[in-house]
């Protein structure tokens, strides 16, 4: 047993039939000795007497908001939340494998710079009875501080006959050197607790691996005299790091019929303008990828060819 | 249709060329060792992220954009001197920062060369013969080193007489190899960005 | 910050039913149990009925077989369904909610409360 907060403690309990479980000795805080009595969430049923009371956790049954009272009066409260391990994992319940980029996926991440600020979500289908916490660090042995805002339901939608929640929350690191080179990665630890069940889940990254710019902006086509080629512009996002000149994108120019089917034209550059052949009832979309360490690319950017 | 995109014109700052051939050499040298060595802990997550150069050289504070000094965390600078001379500055007013940073960059690339070699001598013994480093690497890191061009004494290549663990050796190069490539990206940003200034 | 608003109460004769309601909105994170309560004139307040997060009820002696408590988690409400109705039943009503948010700890909340009067 161990204390996530103040008055609330998170009991691990190896979970399989017939298990024994956990003895816990609940303290009631009080200078008093005489005349305590201990009931479990609001229930008019009396567990027992005394300062201190024992209890064999075993079920979710078990759990909850423990009260000690005197005459009437509340004295102290313990919650108790069990944390579930079968066959030596920690259970996963409340939050969806997202499984990208690979299997066991629970925390996402992402950053359109490197200012040491990014952006994590996580999805659920549970709608109520649901809070969570996120702390992260740089490094673990000897952790520099990154600061995370509170989680919160960012998105809403419905796949099927279930309601999927997403939920995000933003971090920035402390003291970030956008040039620096990353030795240690951050680390990012959420707890989550729906009714009296208490997990956590961890994502471990550098900053240079989940880069994603924003798409390129004033994307801007200008026809060409006498031909069918037009030239496409665009600029930096806002969003990305400076100076451009250290910090370089690289770019795919893709000319996309009106069917998905038809032949996708792209082109790579470095520049922030490109010349292509726009077709009737085409469009023209850019992407944006850092220049010299390949995260992921940017969404595209896209205008009609007319 | 994919088009590869043009090679920078030779009147570009001499650098920039053969920095951006290091990063694709390194690059495909890594993506090289992660296949061959698909067994062996070799993936950015399973490493010790080490820098042979940690407190011997000081790129990053060095070759720091003018921009970014301003940003208090980018300036835990630690003082090291330098020989200034060199022919990436070539008909450039530098400062000695630029200067500093440059001849950063070329120690740099000599710790790794003599890493690399060391390195490759004990793959070579290796009766599995599973993978050696890359002659164009190599010579790309040479190509950059000449187009440096300090004055810097030699450094001896490290034999050592004890039979060597081809599973720590193999282990030792994805780890290089991995902070290779993130200062070879750092060294391409610099050159970018010299060739903007 | 929680909020609970109570609805249904009023007056009603003796043997009579009364359907009351309790709203939970703002951030509630994960809620432990919530519970009725009430408190006549010159009295102590004293618990009602009570519902855990595992949906398990629990009745104060006096009210058991005639009260039945429930909760509709989507909604977020609380209910107290009062049949057989008698006089002693007369009091403010009051919504209680007991939970666990993980950025600042346990809270209670209480309702402004609903009058129940039965009478004839």
């Known amino acids: 047993i161990w204390e996530l907060k103040k008055d609330v403690y998170v009991v691990e309990l190896d979970w399989y039939p017939d298990a024994p479980g956990e003895m816990v000795v609940l303290t009631c805080d009080t200078p008093e000795e005489d005349g305590i009595t201990w009931t479990l969430d609001q229930s008019s049923e009396v567990l027992g007497s005394g300062k201190t009371l024992t209890i064999q956790v075993k079920e979710f049954g078990d759990a909850g908001q423990y009260t000690c009272h005197k005459g009437g009066e509340v004295l102290s409260h313990s919650l108790l939340l069990l944390h579930k391990k079968e066959d030596g994992i920690w259970s996963t319940d409340i939050l969806k494998d997202q499984k990208e980029p690979k299997n066991k996926t629970f925390l996402r991440c992402e950053a359109k710079n490197y200012s040491g600020r990014f952006t994590c979500w996580w999805l659920t289908t549970i709608s109520t009875d649901l809070t969570f916490s996120v702390k992260s660090s740089r490094g673990s042995s000897d952790p520099q501080g990154v600061t995370c805002g509170a989680a919160t339901l960012s998105a809403e939608r419905v796949r099927g006959d279930n309601k999927e929640y997403e939920y995000s929350v933003e971090c920035q690191e402390d003291s970030a050197c956008p040039a620096a080179e990353e030795s240690l990665p951050i680390e990012v630890m959420v707890d989550a607790v729906h009714k009296l069940k208490y997990e956590n889940y961890t994502s471990s990254f550098f900053i240079r691996d989940i880069i994603k710019p924003d798409p390129p902006k004033n994307l801007q086509l200008k026809p060409l005299k006498n031909s069918r080629q037009v030239e496409v512009s665009w600029e930096y996002p806002d969003t990305w790091s400076t100076p451009h000149s250290y910090f370089s994108l690289t770019f795919c120019v893709q000319v996309q019929g009106k069917s998905k089917r038809e032949k996708k034209d792209r082109v790579f550059t470095d520049k922030t303008s490109a010349t292509v052949i726009c077709r009737k009832n085409a469009s023209i979309s850019v992407r944006a990828q850092d220049r010299y360490y390949s995260s992921s690319w940017s969404e595209w950017a896209s205008v009609p060819c007319s | 249709r994919n088009l590869p995109v043009a090679t920078p014109d030779p009147g570009m700052f001499p650098c920039l060329h053969h920095s951006q051939n290091l990063l694709r050499a390194v690059s495909n040298m890594l993506q090289k060792a992660r296949q061959t060595l698909e067994f062996y802990p070799c993936t950015s997550e399973e490493i010790d992220h080490e820098d042979i150069t940690k407190d011997k050289t000081s790129t990053v504070e060095a070759c720091l954009p003018l921009e970014l000094t301003k940003n208090e965390s980018c300036l835990n600078s630690r003082e090291t001197s330098f020989i200034t001379n060199g022919s990436c500055l070539a008909s450039r007013k530098t400062s000695f920062m630029m200067a500093l940073c440059l001849s950063s960059i070329y120690e740099d690339l000599k710790m790794y060369q003599v890493e690399f070699k060391t390195m490759n001598a004990k793959l070579l013994m290796d009766p599995k013969r599973q993978i050696f480093l890359d002659q164009n690497m190599l010579a790309v890191i040479d190509e950059l080193m000449q187009a440096l061009n300090f004055n810097s004494e030699t450094v001896p290549q490290k034999s050592s007489l004890e039979e060597p663990d081809f599973y720590k050796t193999k282990i030792k190069l994805c780890i290089l190899l991995h902070a290779f490539r993130i200062r070879a990206v750092t060294i391409d940003r610099v050159m970018s960005y010299l060739n903007a200034s | 910050e929680v909020q609970l608003v109570e609805s249904g109460g009023g007056l009603v004769q003796p043997g009579g039913s009364l359907r009351l309601s309790c709203v939970a909105s703002?951030?509630?994170?994960?809620?432990?149990?919530m519970a009725w309560y009430r408190q006549a004139p010159g009295k102590q307040r004293e618990l009602v009925a009570s519902?855990?997060?595992?949906?398990?009820?629990n009745y104060q002696e006096s009210v058991k077989g005639r009260f039945t408590i429930s909760r509709d988690n989507a909604e977020n409400t609380l209910y107290l369904q009062m049949n057989s109705l008698s006089p002693e039943d007369t009091a403010v009503y009051l919504c209680?909610?007991?939970?666990?948010?993980?950025?600042?700890?346990?809270?209670?909340?209480w309702g402004q409360g609903t009058q129940v009067t039965v009478s004839s």
């Open positions: 209680n909610l007991r939970g666990l948010r993980l950025d600042t700890g346990l809270y209670e909340s």
């Open positions: 703002g951030s509630t994170g994960s809620i432990t149990s």
């Open positions: 519902i855990n997060s595992g949906g398990r009820p």
